[in-house]
Amino acid sequence: KSPVFGPQEVSSVEGNSVSIKCYYPPTSVNRHTRKYWCRKGASGRCITLVSSEGYVSSNYAGRANLTNFPENGTFVVNIAQLSRDDSGHYKCGLGINSRGLSFDVSLEVSQGPELPNGTEVYTVDVGRTVTIKCPFKTENAPKTKALYKKIGQTSVLVIDSRNYVNPNYKDRIRLRIPGTGQLIFTVVIDRLRLSDHGLYLCQAGDGSNRDEKNADLQVLEPEPELVYEDLRGSVTFHCALGLEVANVAKFLCRVNSRETCDVVINTLGKRDSAFEGRILLNPQDKDGSFSVVITGLRKEDEGRYLCGAHSDGQLQEGWPIQAWQLFVNEESTIPRSPTVVKGVAGGSVAVLCPYNPKESQSLKYWCLWEGAQNGRCPLLVESQGLVQEQYEGRLSLLQEPGNGTFTVILNQLTTQDAGFYWCLTNGDTRWRTTVEIKIIEGEPNLKVPGNVTAVLGETLNIPCHFPCKFSSYEKYWCKWSNTGCQTLPSQDEGPSEAFVNCDENSRLVSLTLNPVTRADEGWYWCGVKQGHFYGETAAVYVAVEEKKVAGSRYVSPAKADAAPDEKVLDSGVREIENKAIQDPRLFAEEKVVADTGDQAGGSRASVDSSSSEEQGGSSK
């Protein structure tokens, strides 16, 4: 007996898709061996149609695939655009077709039911509306019009022109008789249920002269669209339910083991706490369609999702729905990165954001998730250098370390900065990730003056104190602008004896501006890093004023003033929308911080440090 298991019989109709799931013992060998789907021929040989090694036969090209889920011990064969020629005997298996472990599957593709001559077929999704057209002759114009449902050998009256309505159709059916001259009446049934499925008979008049017309109503359950996404990645559910429900509350729910559907998010403001910080319901288009984005996918997010419309914002029978079956692949291409980053008030964080390494030229963004109503994510910074005004001087997006990761640095942290942030690009939308910033108790490791006033033409020296744990880190000063933070030339003095022993007086890296010019005004960052990986930063604002007194100025932390006033957030905040993800230029207009002018450089700015050793770890 083979340990491989699957459906023994699969039946469907022409044009449909099937998704055949085969189970195998998830031993190490089985997980990594070849998986296949083959068709048994008259000779007994089994001809491969699709395999896990990428082979797809010409008969299956463009309509079939095989996906292995090694962590579950399953693989799934999807076959679309079925025809009656696909009917036959197949095997799903592991290893070699002729002697591997396998399971026999019978696939039967039928044409659909035989119907009486002249039957009109109406194929409609559950929850939608159907209009059945019923023609009649002139002599039956004044006579009773009716719609019957055929159940077995009997006919049950559904509605007639004498105002009878079958209780099963109450409040969702109407019979329309047009004005004179039009020899057709219509029956409109709203909010179709699966139980409405079947053969109907239109009738006008009675006796041998009556007009009859058969109608076959096929009410379809939504075929769940199979969605395969990577662990830690992102999924977008696009939901188009039709104009009939354009103004009705929308929802996305997940079907649970009790066969009810738990609301994940709806337009009435409800949201499942398990999706806090990682879900957005994008606004509806005029046609009532909307989309839901979920980032930071977890294994437990797997399952059947339904989107729908109902005034209660939750699933109700007879209202339109769309369905998806989400699978989360644990063998993810998306690298692990911290989902929580901690910082202290006044300190900083450096967040690593993954992106698809094949899209190194894509624009990178960072946005702040806001949970109000359906959720929104105003952009704070992007790789082209635009930064929200309130983040001026304390936020920067760096392309480093590159090769699938960029860095976002946020400093001068306050408790208001706690929350969820999204990393995204204008490329592969599946690589959106979420990180939560938490503000914890503690003191910043790097100490700089709060505010510095420099005098034109003089020398300015700004100290940055760091603790012993950063002794082996690379230290730097940079001048912040809305396009990044330009590193200033370093004048390291080399390791002194005092520094090697981490002497109190040696834990200092200083920035010298000589002579001070107008262009030197702005934000400066002192930071530590290790290669291309950034650690903590501290920011100081340098204001430049006219000469009042002679001599150079040394500013110590004791003389630090308050930081300059924060600018107010502009109202035209950019948000993630369907269109915007594809084309960031489609975001709403936004005020940007003007470039702060020439970078400090040349021999005028120098960084003094008692160390030139490389950085040795993360400051987080």
Epitope: S11, R193, E223, E259, Q325
Partner: nanobody, 126 residues
Framework: EVQLVESGGGLVQAGDSLRLSCAAS????????MGWFRQAPGKDREFVAT??????????YYADPVKGRFTISRDNAKNTVYLQMNSLKPEDTAVYYC?????????????????WGQGTLVTVSS
């Protein structure tokens, strides 16, 4: 909630046939999986057959001991699933339970099913 009511059990001779029915009522519009498990006296409950569906596509799963003898089917309009049992053997004697769920990862695992009927007794005498 979903209610499941089994019927059709009884006493038959070895080699005879029997047809079990399971009618589902209540909130069945998200039900996509229905099946049968059985429990012989003094034994664990075991998988017999399951039918899962999606639109007009059906998938039928059977346990090895019943393959080729038992057939599972459903009537969508009546929210009913059937188990046609042919060539019955004494070892088929058990209480047969109908079960349903929205989605199951593995149809053979009984803990993946949300709802269970009270069971109907099938006795096959030799």
């Amino acid at each position: 909630e979903v209610q499941l009511v089994e019927s059709g059990g009884g006493l038959v001779q070895a080699g005879d046939s029997l047809r079990l029915s399971c009618a589902a009522s209540g909130r069945t519009f998200t039900t996509y999986v229905m099946g049968w498990f059985r429990q012989a006296p003094g034994k664990d409950r075991e998988f017999v057959a399951t039918i899962t569906w999606s639109g007009s596509t059906n998938y039928k799963y059977y346990a090895d001991p019943v393959k080729g003898r038992f057939t599972i089917s459903r009537d969508n309009a009546k929210n009913t699933v059937y188990l046609q049992m042919n060539s019955l053997k004494p070892e088929d004697t058990a209480v047969y339970y109908c079960t349903s769920s929205t989605v199951v990862t593995d149809p053979r695992k009984l803990n993946e099913y949300a709802y269970w009927g009270q069971g109907t007794l099938v006795t096959v005498s030799s």
